[in-house]
Interface confidence: low
């Protein structure tokens, strides 16, 4: 799915050596210039230009400090493992002047029985083992330390936690003679937090647990547990928040029902039902109590688990999420779409929008896509004129101000941003789509016609003539 969109990726930089206990060299002064965007209410462009100029002027003094790489640290506690028993780990880039910590959970589907886990191990070993992980990763999108790429939290301590447990970050079972694979997703998060406390997280003001796709669902499943863990360890002052990207799925009726044969075609409810048993999956306690034994699978679905969560969570979800469409057996192969499928897709967008109506902090563009927050161009998409980094900044402010009695949204700083137009890519800022076969970029008008949308039907609710709509869409307005 990723191949259809045009996202810029930066090249890797040469790897520095690994660090087991991060710290400045003895006697080395620890300096940084933390900037807080809460103070910036004027011209953001002008401010960003000043920041860039400052960064460039400081670059010669501290080229090493601007290294974008996050470095790999395998867990010291090697009993907390990936599926194959190799130690789990995390990539870290510290920002010594900042008390903000961003922990990002990687995504990558799941497997829920011996057969499809064996197949996953053969084809996607990186998602089941740490053996071949690179020593460094470049932080992109919300993990970038460049203010232009990450105007939201560029100065934070960045942690990327690779997904190697195949359990939607929910498992709590180790590898044994009986179990061919370990499923320790929930335990990996706990152990990473435990080790990070020894690397400066203990001084954090805010911990933002973020994730995309299965990692986004992982945020919903683990955010309260992380907050509880920090409280128990004596750090109640660390504010734990969640950012769930592309992990808010619906347990809706599939477009075409298929038997539960593999990860992709199995209906999400059935896949998770089987998975929980196979992984010894754990779900948030308050959610678990709402369902009978054996019905814990319900807690993997955002709209069911969200109301039970105590931590603030910001939900980012494309209204026409490609992973959702895949599990619903909707495969857009490049052939024009029949009316039944078109209505199914539109209804999906409507249902998703409905589940977000009571989620105060949400960003849901009407696009056909999957994942956004660690894309380099995550700043480009807007909903009602507001970009995602701006919405997250407004969310931070709203949480900062929430001790005040007023519950009214901050003026000019919205956090509930859900597109209301009813068809895929009706938002002109959606990521560019490519024709799967020719590789050609398509503008929105081409895409909609390609999808079989009749311009008359699309234009009418907007009070436009088809020719006017085509003109608007072709100009990207």
């Amino acid at each position: 799915s990723e191949g259809r969109k045009t996202w810029r990726r930066r090249g890797q930089q040469p790897p520095p050596p690994p660090r087991t206990e991060a710290a400045p060299a003895a006697g080395q002064p620890v300096e940084s210039f933390p900037l807080d965007f809460t103070a910036v209410e004027g011209n953001m462009d002008s401010f960003m230009a000043q920041v860039k100029s400052l960064a460039q002027s400081l670059y010669p003094c501290s080229a090493q400090q601007l290294n974008e790489d996050l470095r790999l640290h395998l867990l010291l506690n090697t009993s907390v493992t990936c599926n194959d028993g190799s130690p789990a780990g995390y990539y870290l880039k510290e920002s010594r002047g900042s008390r903000r910590w961003l922990l990002f959970l990687e995504g990558g589907w799941y497997c829920f029985n011996r057969e499809n886990c064996d197949s996953r191990y053969d084809t996607m070993r990186r998602l089941m083992s740490s053996r071949d992980w690179p020593r460094t990763r470049t932080g992109t999108g919300i993990l970038s330390s460049q203010p232009e790429e990450n105007p939201y939290w560029w100065n934070a301590n960045m942690v990327f936690i690779p997904y190697c447990s195949s359990d939607v970050w929910s498992g709590a079972s180790s590898k044994s003679e009986k179990n061919e694979y370990a499923f320790m997703g929930a335990l990996i998060i706990q152990e990473v937090v435990r080790e990070l406390l020894g690397r400066g997280l203990s001084g954090a003001k805010v911990l933002l647990l973020a994730g995309s796709s299965a990692g986004g669902t992982g945020v919903l499943l683990n955010v309260d547990r992380v907050a509880e863990q920090l409280e128990k360890l004596g750090y109640p002052a660390i504010q734990v928040r969640g950012l769930a990207d592309s992990g808010w799925f619906l347990d809706n009726k599939q477009y075409r029902h298929t038997d539960c044969v593999d990860t992709i075609t199995c209906a999400p409810t059935e896949a998770i039902r089987r998975g929980i048993r196979y992984w010894n999956g754990v779900v948030p306690e308050r959610c678990r109590r709402q369902f009978q034994e054996g019905e814990e699978w319900n807690c993997f679905f955002g709209y069911k688990v969200y109301p039970t969560l105590r931590c603030p969570v910001f939900v980012v979800q494309w209204l026409f999420d490609e992973a959702q469409l895949t599990v619903d057996n909707v495969h857009l192969t490049g052939q024009p779409v029949q009316e039944g499928l078109r209505l199914y897709i539109q209804n999906l967008g409507r249902e998703l929008r409905h589940t977000l109506k009571d989620v105060p902090a949400s960003f849901a563009p009407a696009c056909l896509s999957h994942e956004i927050i660690i894309r380099s161009h995550w700043t480009d998409v807007q909903v009602k004129g507001t970009s995602l980094p701006r919405a997250l900044h407004c969310w931070d402010r709203s949480l900062h101000d929430s001790h005040k009695a007023s519950k009214t949204p901050l003026k000019g700083c919205p956090v509930h941003l859900v597109d209301s137009c009813p068809w895929p890519h009706c938002n002109p800022s959606c990521p560019t789509v490519r024709d799967q076969f020719t590789g050609q970029e398509m503008n929105v008008a081409q895409f909609l016609m390609h999808m079989g949308f009749d311009m008359q039907t699309v234009a009418q609710p907007q009070g436009l003539e088809p020719s006017e709509l085509l003109g608007m869409l072709s100009n990207g307005s």
Partner: antibody, heavy 119, light 111 residues
């Protein structure tokens, strides 16, 4: 000058307790993970315990788990090892050592303090 | 636990010759391009002193006649040319997993 100085060793009865200390100087103590490593007379080196820079994470060798407690006082640049239920096989020279950031090796060692468990 | 075996308990080498001390791990101590094996020198009545870290990196202040090599399970410490002050016991140590373990040591004697 970077230095670690252990103290508090001595003769202890089997089943008894002892707390040994390690004073650090010449470096930012609170930034480093620290370990205790011991060496029985005429024997090799044995890792005993680890504590992270902020005191949150601790790990122990199975031989001492439940009996020894590693702790630190970052304000006073001091590392401790509280030993209880001591056995004759705990008789050793106890070294405190600093963990380097690059990969879990010990780049600074103290001169050691001797703990003898005997009746 | 990862067991480190130093096959030679002692080794006698003439001044100016090469001393080769080996260490074998019961399972690989390499990961992600790094080998978590380190070497220390210990003289009687003194604490150990770090010589080589991450298999092949020379600790600052250590003479260049010391070198380390190897990956996976087999590692070697070389001293060439051997000098009088090199008479000591040499230990390997891994940090690939917990518990951290040391080899039993190889005593280098001068002929």
């Amino acid at each position: 000058d970077v230095q670690l100085v252990e103290s508090g060793g001595g003769l202890v009865q089997p089943g008894g307790s002892r707390k040994i200390s390690c004073a650090a100087s010449g470096f930012t103590f609170s930034s480093y993970g620290m370990h205790w490593v011991r060496q029985a007379p005429e024997k090799g080196l044995e890792w005993v315990a680890y504590i992270s820079s902020s005191t949150v994470t601790t790990y122990y060798a199975d031989t001492v788990k439940g009996r020894f407690t590693i702790s630190r006082d970052n304000a006073n640049n001091t590392l401790f090892l509280q030993m209880t239920s001591l056995r004759s096989e705990d008789t050793a020279m106890y070294y405190c050592s600093r963990q380097n950031w690059d990969g879990g090796y010990f780049d600074v060692w103290g001169a050691g303090t001797t703990v003898t468990v005997s009746s | 636990d990862i067991v480190l075996t130093q096959s030679l308990a002692s080794l006698a080498v003439s001044l100016g010759q090469r001393a080769t001390i080996s260490c074998r791990a019961s399972k690989s101590v390499s990961s992600s391009g790094y080998s978590y094996m380190h070497w220390y020198q210990q003289k009687p009545g003194q604490p150990p002193k770090l010589l080589i870290y991450l298999a092949s990196n020379l600790e600052s202040g250590v003479p260049a006649r010391f070198s380390g090599s190897g990956s996976g399970t087999d590692f070697t410490l070389n001293i060439h040319p051997v000098e009088e002050e090199d008479a000591a016991t040499y230990y390997c140590q891994h940090s690939r997993a917990l518990p951290l373990t040391f080899g039993a040591g190889t005593k280098l004697e001068l002929k």
